[in-house]
């Protein structure tokens, strides 16, 4: 099972983190990244089964993102369009994870260097006016078998963990205080 955030094992890339990727960039409405059954990728205002993701380090600082419900990997075309694929293509579906000082993360295609951001509202497939990288807040996700506890209205605390926080973070990125030794 995915391990708790407090575990020192998260200092290594071997573990799967179950997360919702939440973005609240000013240019678009607040949303959780969703990988849908038909392979489209979009944003949902609320957490949903389609937005529960598994983040796993492939290499130091590089991750793959799997939709738990759909068993589809998050992938990106050379033009920046996002899609969900049952087949993992390392060229299209690997993302460099960069930690920001405020607890948010930025994801870039390892192959193309293109930033990951949700499609704009006009088109479900691609954003015709690419912007800078979107910032995502990884929110903890419960294991699939466990329902969300009822009656909790407060937002979940931010998870500032990285799949590999002790390895490849360059001098320009922040380091999460939760991993300070």
């Amino acid at each position: 099972h995915p391990i708790p955030d407090s575990s020192p094992l998260l200092q290594f890339g071997g573990q799967v983190r179950q997360r919702y990727l939440y973005t609240d960039d000013a240019q678009q409405t607040e949303a959780h990244l969703e990988i849908r059954e038909d392979g489209t990728v979009g944003g949902a205002a609320d957490q949903s089964p389609e937005s529960l993701l598994q983040l796993k380090a492939l290499k130091p600082g590089v991750i793959q993102i799997l939709g738990v419900k759909t068993s589809r990997f998050l992938c990106q075309r050379p033009d920046g369009a996002l899609y969900g694929s049952l087949h993992f293509d390392p060229e299209a579906c690997s993302f460099r994870e960069l930690l920001l000082e405020d607890g948010y993360n930025v994801y870039q295609s390892e192959a193309h260097g293109l930033p990951l951001h949700l499609p704009g509202n006009k088109s479900p497939h691609r954003d015709p006016a690419p912007r800078g990288p979107a910032r995502f807040l990884p929110l903890p996700g419960l294991p699939p078998a466990l329902p969300e506890p009822p009656g909790i209205l407060a937002p979940q605390p931010p998870d500032v963990g990285s799949s590999d926080p002790l390895s490849m973070v360059g001098p320009s990125q922040g380091r999460s205080p939760s991993y300070a030794s």
Epitope: G13, G14, Q15, V16, K59, P60, L66, S167, M168
Partner: antibody, heavy 117, light 107 residues
Framework: EVQLQQSGPELVKPGASVKIPCKAS????????MGWVKQSHGKSLEWIGD????????INNQNFKGKATLTVDKSSSTAYMELRSLASEDTAVYYC??????????WGQGTSVTVSS | DIQMTQSPASLSASVGETVIITCRAS??????LAWYQQKQGKSPQLLVY???TLAEGVPSRFSGSGSGTQFSLKINSLQPEDFGSYYC?????????FGGGTKVEIK
């Protein structure tokens, strides 16, 4: 071409230690995790542990706690595994591997360790 | 730890036949399953990972499928160089564990 070069066979006495090197070439050493796998004669494979070459952080199979210590030397692109307090059940072939999301995409040729008095 | 159970333990097949090897995980491992081939006296080689992604240089006659806890490796039109042992391995969460292996022999 990616290559993981291991040292030759080792014959060691019970209670002794052995340190097996694995020299990586053909790729950037710090870009991938390095791992180790045990294969006893005629048996399946057992994952021992992985190490992040950037910082030496390791994650180990608890079955090998106190038995195997993983280290790296970035300057020579070499990973090491030290096995201590060797006993007959440690007789096996030990492989170094390159890790990619937990899959092991390249393997060394293996180092045979025989524990015998 | 997650247990991986492979079947059959061994099989005999002729060149040109189709072979299917199965692997069962003791719990859900999602899409994190790999397959390896090992020839006598040699190191294992990665064939497939993430259930169905072929490793570099692996012929397209190999294919992986499955989900959750049940997986299979299919070899279409078995070639002489395909004989050897095959192992499944989960790469969901450490410790990674392997199946007991399937020995594919010439009939």
């Amino acid at each position: 071409e990616v290559q993981l070069q291991q040292s030759g066979p080792e014959l060691v006495k019970p209670g002794a230690s052995v340190k097996i090197p694995c020299k990586a070439s053909g790729y950037t050493f710090t870009d991938y995790y390095m791992g180790w796998v045990k294969q006893s004669h005629g048996k399946s494979l057992e994952w021992i542990g992985d190490i992040n070459p950037n910082n030496g952080v390791t994650i180990n199979n608890q079955n090998f706690k106190g038995k195997a210590t993983l280290t790296v030397d970035k300057s020579s692109s070499t990973a090491y595994m030290e096995l201590r307090s060797l006993a007959s059940e440690d007789t096996a072939v030990y492989y170094c591997t390159r890790g990619y999301g937990g899959a092991l995409d390249y393997w060394g040729q293996g180092t045979s360790v025989t524990v015998s008095s | 730890d997650i247990q991986m159970t492979q079947s059959p333990a061994s099989l005999s097949a002729s060149v040109g036949e189709t072979v299917i090897i199965t692997c069962r995980a003791s719990e859900n491992i999602y899409s994190y399953l790999a397959w390896y081939q090992q020839k006598q006296g040699k190191s294992p080689q990665l064939l497939v990972y993430n259930i169905r992604t072929l490793a570099e240089g692996v012929p397209s006659r190999f294919s992986g499928s499955g989900s959750g806890t049940q997986f299979s490796l299919k070899i279409n039109s078995l070639q002489p160089e395909d004989f050897g042992s095959y192992y499944c391995q989960h790469h969901y969460d450490s410790p990674w564990t392997f199946g007991g292996g399937t020995k594919v022999e010439i009939k």
